[in-house]
């Protein structure tokens, strides 16, 4: 889980090692702060849980791409 050491900086210290369907993901944000030990992606799920993930993993990249497309596509 993400950890806010000194708000508003949130860091990830561990990544999930389980693949999660993009259909459980609502949004994401990238963690690139130099105050954090590693770059990370924090996914927010449909039930508002936050998950730290490794941006180097393919499923994480694919999920970010999917969420990007989803927000670009206007709902009919």
């Amino acid at each position: 889980q993400p950890d806010a050491i000194n708000a508003p900086v949130t860091c990830c210290y561990n990544f999930t090692n389980r693949k999660i369907s993009v259909q459980r993901l609502a949004s994401y944000r990238r963690i690139t702060s130099s105050k954090c030990p590693k770059e990370a992606v924090i996914f927010k799920t449909i039930v508002a849980k936050e998950i730290c993930a490794d941006p180097k993993q393919k499923w994480v990249q694919d999920s970010m791409d999917h969420l990007d497309k989803q927000t670009q596509t206007p709902k009919t």
């Epitope: 693949k19 999660i20 259909q23 459980r24 609502a26 449909i46 039930v47 709902k75």
Partner: antibody, heavy 119, light 113 residues
Framework: QVQLVQSGAEVKKPGASVKVSCKVS????????MHWVRQAPGKGLEWMGG????????IYAQKFQGRVTMTEDTSTDTVYMELSSLRSEDTAMYYC????????????WGQGTLVTVSS | DIVMTQSPDSLAVSLGERATINCKSS????????????LVWYQQKPGQPPKLLIY???IRESGVPDRFSGSGSGTDFTLTISSLQAEDVAVYYC?????????FGGGTKVEIK
């Protein structure tokens, strides 16, 4: 393709514990989210718990909290479900179940392990 | 917890006739942002583990005959077998996967009349 093979049937006395195993092949355990579902004779399906990537930990149905422990051995790609303080109502078929990407539903199931609790 | 209620408990249908099973959730399992219903249907035959039939409320799993269809949204869902075959005799369960604890309906037993 994921395959799940469970350990054999068990007969236990009331008050005892049982440990059921589920061996994964075709995938490594760390790529999956393994769960356990049980079914008493002639009854419906009941989710017991499993590893929830959204919580980052194993979670249990409230009914079984304190009596069930689910563990993983990543070196052998095997998961275990241990149920303690057994009573006759725990007589059931116990299934492990998973899906390659965690969604919350299951498209791969073990063959089931029958646990009979009888004095 | 989301409570899943199935009806009827059992159903006897003539071969070639339509079978309809209902499933109601105590709260919505629709996530409006992606317009997906987090509901699945399983078929279970005696002595076998459940088999996935329908996911996202209406998408047939590959290899499942097209006589099986799922419909509904929000809290009310239906599994329809358009023309019952002998091999469809089984118990059918709905399950919500919107949130944990994961919960199943009580099951509907489908038999031949």
């Amino acid at each position: 393709q994921v395959q799940l093979v469970q350990s054999g049937a068990e007969v236990k006395k009331p008050g005892a514990s049982v440990k059921v195993s589920c061996k994964v092949s075709g995938y490594t355990l760390t790529e999956l989210s393994m769960h356990w579902v049980r079914q008493a004779p002639g009854k419906g399906l009941e989710w017991m718990g499993g590893f929830d990537p959204e919580d980052g930990e194993t979670i249990y149905a409230q009914k079984f909290q304190g009596r069930v422990t689910m563990t993983e051995d990543t070196s052998t790609d095997t998961v275990y479900m241990e149920l303690s303080s057994l009573r006759s109502e725990d007589t059931a078929m116990y299934y492990c179940a998973t899906r390659e990407f965690w969604t919350g539903y299951f498209d791969h199931w073990g063959q089931g392990t029958l646990v009979t609790v009888s004095s | 917890d989301i409570v899943m209620t199935q009806s009827p408990d059992s159903l006897a249908v003539s071969l070639g006739e339509r079978a309809t099973i209902n499933c109601k959730s105590s709260q919505s399992v629709l996530y409006s942002s992606n317009n997906k219903n987090y509901l699945v249907w399983y078929q279970q035959k005696p002595g076998q583990p459940p088999k996935l039939l329908i996911y996202w409320a209406s998408i047939r799993e590959s290899g499942v005959p097209d006589r099986f269809s799922g419909s509904g949204s929000g809290t009310d869902f239906t599994l329809t077998i358009s023309s019952l075959q002998a091999e469809d005799v089984a118990v059918y369960y709905c399950q919500q996967y919107y949130s944990t604890p994961l919960t199943f309906g009580g099951g509907t037993k489908v038999e031949i009349k």
